[in-house]
Interface confidence: medium
């Protein structure tokens, strides 16, 4: 049978031929009667055999990493007979490893993100190198990792390539680090080969910084004419963090939040100071408010960085605006008796300049020929007043600053003209009536009523009487009904159209004013010829008859 040992050939041998081993048949007695042959891939080119002895040689430099074993076939032939002495047999030549490959990092580039302020031991990333040498051949492919750059912040586990944090890092001081890792084979022993890789480690932000005001004092101004809601200025805090960790909220400390407010512009991260309540320079010309700023999002575990909110003082000066005069009252109502003489006192109005300058005020009454006003605000009559023409005056008073005539205020002025008893009562209409010739005594001729243009505090009460002459010598009499009316009655029987066609009766009407006023009013009575039926009459004046609607023949 065949006799051989396992065949090994070291890779990378530079000699022209390298003896690997011997193939032989146990029938071979060494007399050179056998011939050995090599068949298969590499036979003749990579490996040759001594046909007489069966010695195998490698005639080429081999690379295990390219091919680590060769499977060949061997034949042995009896030279004399040309027949195979042994059956053809397969055998293996293994290429043995030498440390001719350095470790290589195949997954480059390496990049990792880790939160800033992470504690020691936090895993960052694992790097892995590979070595093409034979892992089963000694230490040729056994690797050790070490840190060439990155101390003191990072460390690498020698056997796993796991990178860990070894010292806390602050993103606000440095936000990324380049770490260089070396992998050495031969577990670092002399003659080891090495490879390196770079790892970019970026620190992600955590909210470890509170916002801080850029200024300890801000100065702002607001006009006293500014409406509520006006933005009067901005304040700004800065936060070394980024993204949502730098989002902040501004507020006013409780005591100071009556007049102003602060809203946050979340795009610019500025605080906008807003006027919450109108200000008045003359009441308070400056304000001090204390503002504070806090982060919008602070996780519980990071509250230790945010114990005291940053504060700032805002000094707000109110700017004076020239304001129009201010009347003491929103409107004035005065009373004055009618018929008072020109120049009579009506009342006093008063306006003042609300500004600290206290400009003198000039007054005027718009569109009035009846009243005057002087620079003291005293109103007097410029004409006599007649309540029966106008009982109320609805006017407008204007106050103007002496040194700035554009500053004007106007308010309503109502003047009531009070009544005096300056009108006697009169007939409510013109009375003209008739009496029949055949009228009897006590016959009602006419009911009369009166009016008085004066205003009465109580109800008007009129008193009716005949004049003295008519009382003494009258064909008629009067009865006062006590209701501001009276009736005229005949005081005799029978009248004569031809002798006395018309009577003029003087009626006195007195009012109940103090003093009482009396007027004399004439009642005209025509004598008419009346038929028995009363359907036809003849009077002196046909017009009268027609106007009274009587039929005529």
């Amino acid at each position: 049978g065949w006799v051989w040992n396992q065949f090994f050939v070291p890779e990378e041998m530079n000699t022209t031929s390298h003896h690997i081993g011997q193939l032989r048949s146990d029938l071979d007695n060494g007399n050179n009667s056998f011939q050995y042959k090599l068949l298969g891939a590499g036979a003749g080119s990579t490996f040759i055999i001594d046909e007489r002895t069966g010695d195998i040689y490698a005639i080429q430099k081999l690379d295990r990493e390219e091919r680590s074993l060769y499977i060949l076939r061997a034949q042995v032939i009896d030279i004399a007979t040309g027949r195979a002495v042994e059956p053809e047999s397969e055998f293996v030549i293994k290429v043995s490893d030498i440390n001719d490959n350095e470790p290589k990092f195949l997954d480059e580039p390496y990049e990792a993100i880790v939160p800033e302020m992470s504690p020691e031991g936090t895993l960052v990333i694992q790097v892995t190198a590979s070595d093409a040498d034979d892992p089963s051949s000694g230490n040729n492919a056994r690797l050790l990792y070490s840190l060439l750059q990155g101390q003191p912040y990072f460390s690498v586990e020698p056997t796993t390539g796991v990178i860990r944090i070894s010292s806390k890092m602050d993103r606000e001081l440095q936000d990324e680090y380049w770490v260089i890792i070396q992998a050495k084979d031969m577990i670092g022993q002399p003659g080891a080969l090495s490879g390196t890789t770079s790892v970019l480690i970026k620190l992600s932000d955590v909210n470890d910084n509170k916002p801080i005001f850029k200024e300890s004092l801000y100065r702002l101004t607001v006009s006293e004419s500014a409406p509520t809601g006006t933005s009067i200025g901005t304040i700004m805090a800065y936060d070394n963090d980024i993204g949502e960790n730098a989002e902040m909220d501004y507020s006013i400390e409780e005591d100071d939040s009556q007049t102003f407010d602060i809203i946050t512009n979340h795009e610019t991260q500025e605080g906008i100071v807003i006027l919450k309540k109108k200000v008045d320079f003359e009441h308070q010309n400056h304000y001090g408010i204390r503002a504070k700023v806090k982060n919008h999002h602070v996780p519980e575990q990071l509250m230790k960085y945010h114990t005291e909110a940053s504060t700032t003082f805002i000094k707000i000066q109110v700017e004076d605006v020239d304001e129009p005069p201010l009347f003491l009252l929103p409107y004035y109502v005065f009373e004055v008796f009618e018929e008072t003489p020109q120049g009579s006192f009506v009342g006093v109005v008063s306006a003042t300049d609300p500004d600290n300058r206290k400009s003198p005020i000039r007054y005027s009454i718009t569109r009035s020929k009846v009243f005057n006003i002087n620079d003291n605000g005293t109103i007097t009559t410029s004409n006599s007043l007649d309540r029966e023409i106008s009982a109320w005056y609805n006017l407008s008073i204007t106050a103007t600053e002496k040194y700035n005539i554009e500053q004007i205020s106007s308010i309503p002025l109502y003047v009531q003209v009070l009544n005096i008893n300056d009108h006697a009562p009169e007939f409510s209409q013109y009375y003209e009536t008739y009496v029949c010739e055949n009228a009897g005594s006590g016959q009602v001729i006419q009911t009369i009523s009166a009016v008085d243009r004066d205003e009465s505090i109580e109800e008007h009460h009129f008193y009716f009487n005949l004049s003295v002459e008519d009382t003494n010598n009258s064909s008629f009499t009067i009865i006062d009904n006590q209701d501001n009316t009276a009736v005229i009655l005949t005081n005799r029987t029978g009248f004569n159209l031809q002798e006395e066609p018309v009577f003029y009766i003087s009626i006195l009407i007195a009012d109940n004013g103090i003093p009482s006023l009396t007027s004399t009013n004439t009642l005209t009575i025509h004598v008419c010829d009346c038929g028995d039926s009363g359907s036809t009459q003849t009077c002196q004046y046909q017009e009268l008859v027609l106007s009274m609607g009587f039929k005529t023949e």
């Epitope: 300890s216 004092l217 100065r219 101004t221 005591d255 100071d256 009556q258 308070q284 010309n285 400056h286 304000y287 001090g288 408010i289 204390r290 003082f313 000094k315 000066q317």
Partner: antibody, heavy 119, light 107 residues
């Protein structure tokens, strides 16, 4: 050291004028609002005027508005008070005072300069 | 304007005694914007207290301020010889006004 020194006081007739100066040293003058405060035996301490750190705003007490003018020269670290149309009641010791950075009280005062208005 | 009234006008005490000075405002002083000053003859006023109760830099802790709204107090716990002077309160919440002063004199 940190100090304020007033000068320019004196005796003046009613209707006359005076210009007071206040020299600042030892601190960043241009960062502070500055005031004038006067002291009379009758009325005690009375605030007169304030000027903001950069001169952009000036405010006066009612009693002096229109007659007094406050100004400053930050390049020379000096505060001024121009007093015109002086009245007898303006007689007082005039102090310049520094407002604090966070409020309106006065943390630094000068020694004062006496202004006497008399006929 | 806010009128500040100090009482008493004069306080006669001996060194080592406690001094209590009062300052009353005619209307509420916003956010306790009240300061106390000390003035010695021929000298400028010196800031003692601001914000009603905060001690100014370099002021000994025997000086303390309290109060809010309209009533404020300056207390000197143990009078030292150098504490005899005139004390003024000042409000700075609405313009600037001072009290008329309280003189602390040696008994």
């Amino acid at each position: 050291q940190v100090q304020l020194v007033e000068s320019g006081g004196g005796v003046v007739q009613p209707g006359g004028s005076l210009r007071l100066s206040c020299a600042a040293s030892g601190f960043s003058f241009s960062s502070y609002d500055m005031d004038w405060v006067r002291q009379t035996p009758g009325k005690g301490l009375e605030w007169v005027a304030v000027i903001w750190y950069d001169g952009s705003n000036k405010y006066y007490a009612d009693s002096v508005r229109g007659r007094f003018t406050i100004s400053r020269d930050n390049s020379k670290n000096t505060l001024f008070l121009q007093m015109n149309s002086l009245r007898v009641e303006d007689t007082a010791v005039y102090y310049c005072a520094r407002e604090t950075g966070e409020g309106w009280y006065f943390d630094l005062w000068g020694r004062g300069t006496l202004v006497t208005v008399s006929s | 304007e806010i009128v500040l009234t100090q009482s008493p006008g004069t306080l006669s005490l001996s060194p080592g005694e406690r001094a209590t000075l009062s300052c009353r405002a005619s209307q509420s002083v916003s956010s306790s914007y009240l300061a106390w000053y000390q003035q010695k003859p021929g000298q400028a006023p010196r800031l003692l207290i601001y914000g009603a109760s905060s001690r100014a830099t370099g002021i000994p802790d025997r000086f303390s301020g309290s109060g809010s709204g309209t009533d404020f107090t300056l207390t000197i716990s143990r009078l030292e010889p150098e504490d005899f002077a005139v004390y003024y309160c000042q409000q700075y919440g609405s313009s600037w006004t001072f009290g008329q002063g309280t003189k602390v004199e040696i008994k």
